[in-house]
């Protein structure tokens, strides 16, 4: 049965031009983490495998950083930037759990600055 | 076109140390982990390890933890592949690989260095 | 470690066959894994990647199928430049296990 939940940043808005960092956490259970894909629609940005270390999708190495922990840090932020995130953590034994963060990104600078996880 | 060429074969002794180079090109050398994975004759196919060209970082087999060493020069686009107290059983052809874009297989190989380990 | 058990180890054919090589993974893989071609004296070649997308260059006739523990490649219509060894790989867990092959032979 799985019992746990993901806690994610939520709905979060950032400045054109600047980094932000997507963040879930996985709680309320005792499943072992085996990997964690980080996707964007349906294009992969970047896996952290517990064995294996991280993989960052070429086409977006240049602007995403591995961490802080299992999150990613996207960087140089565009417009075209603004959309659905998803972390999906690979447990063992429960199976897969999924979290979504929305993100928009502001051509102005009053980006609201609410996000827990965000870097200024 | 994507090109992965390997160093020539060696033979040596047990206890001696070899080390592979494998060189790319027709990518953009950072952008992609390189691995080594080998193969005894008449075999199958066994990993080895994966290296960052960009950070250096290296993921090591648990089994080869304690003798192999994985390297990069940047400025060659060429990544080696040493292992150390070589033994008889490491009698293999030695494959360097390039990390696909989705995920830890394989999706460009060099041709092969045919290590032999004899006395 | 995650085993990856191919099966048959060799099988024979013809021109023109439909041909299905199975793989078994000792626990849940997802849909992460990878098939690989090699002929005699040469590198292996990746055909397909997540169990089902087929790699850049990979005939039609090649596909891929399954998740979680049982996998299947199909050769839809077996052509001479088929015949080679096939190989499985889960690519998403140390130490990157590879199944024992199943060698393609003529007829």
């Known amino acids: 049965m799985m019992t746990g939940t993901i806690e994610t940043t939520g709905n979060i808005s950032a400045e054109k031009g600047g980094s932000i960092i997507l963040q879930c956490h996985l709680s309320s259970t005792t499943a072992q983490v085996t990997q964690v894909n980080w996707e964007q629609q349906d294009q992969l940005l970047a896996i952290c495998n517990a064995d294996l270390g991280w993989h960052i999708s070429p086409s977006f190495k240049d602007r995403v950083a591995p961490g802080p922990g299992l999150g990613l840090t996207l960087q140089s932020l565009t417009v075209n930037d603004t959309g659905e995130y998803f972390c999906i953590y690979h447990t063992y034994p429960d199976g897969t759990y999924t979290g979504r963060i929305f993100l928009e990104v502001l051509e102005s600078s009053v980006a609201e600055h609410g996000a827990r996880f965000q870097i200024p | 076109e994507v090109q992965l060429v390997q160093s020539g074969a060696e033979v040596k002794k047990p206890g001696a140390s070899v080390k592979v180079s494998c060189k790319a090109s027709?990518?953009?050398?950072?952008?992609?982990?390189m691995h080594w994975v080998r193969q005894a004759p008449g075999q199958g196919l066994e990993w080895m390890g994966r290296?960052?060209?960009?950070?250096?970082?290296?993921k090591y087999n648990e089994k080869f933890k304690t003798r192999v060493t994985m390297t990069v020069d940047t400025s060659t686009s060429t990544v080696y592949m040493e292992l150390s107290s070589l033994r008889s059983e490491d009698t293999a052809v030695y494959y360097c690989a390039r990390e696909g874009a989705y995920g830890y297989y394989f999706d460009y190989w060099g041709q092969g260095t045919l290590v032999t380990v004899s006395s | 470690d995650i085993q990856m058990t191919q099966s048959p180890s060799s099988l024979s054919a013809s021109v023109g066959d439909r041909v299905t090589i199975t793989c078994r993974a000792s626990?849940?893989?997802?849909?992460?894994l990878a098939w690989y071609q090699q002929k005699p004296g040469k590198s292996p070649k990746l055909l397909i990647y997540n169990a089902r997308t087929l790699a850049e260059g990979v005939p039609s006739r090649f596909s891929g199928s399954g998740s979680g523990t049982d996998f299947t490649l199909t050769i839809s219509s077996l052509q001479p430049e088929d015949f080679a060894t096939y190989y499985c790989?889960?690519?998403?867990?140390?130490?990157?296990?590879f199944g024992g092959g199943t060698k393609v032979e003529i007829k």
């Open positions: 290296i960052d060209p960009d950070s250096t970082g290296s």
């Open positions: 626990e849940n893989i997802y849909s992460y």
């Open positions: 027709g990518y953009t050398f950072t952008n992609y982990w």
């Open positions: 790989q889960y690519h998403s867990g140390s130490p990157l296990p």
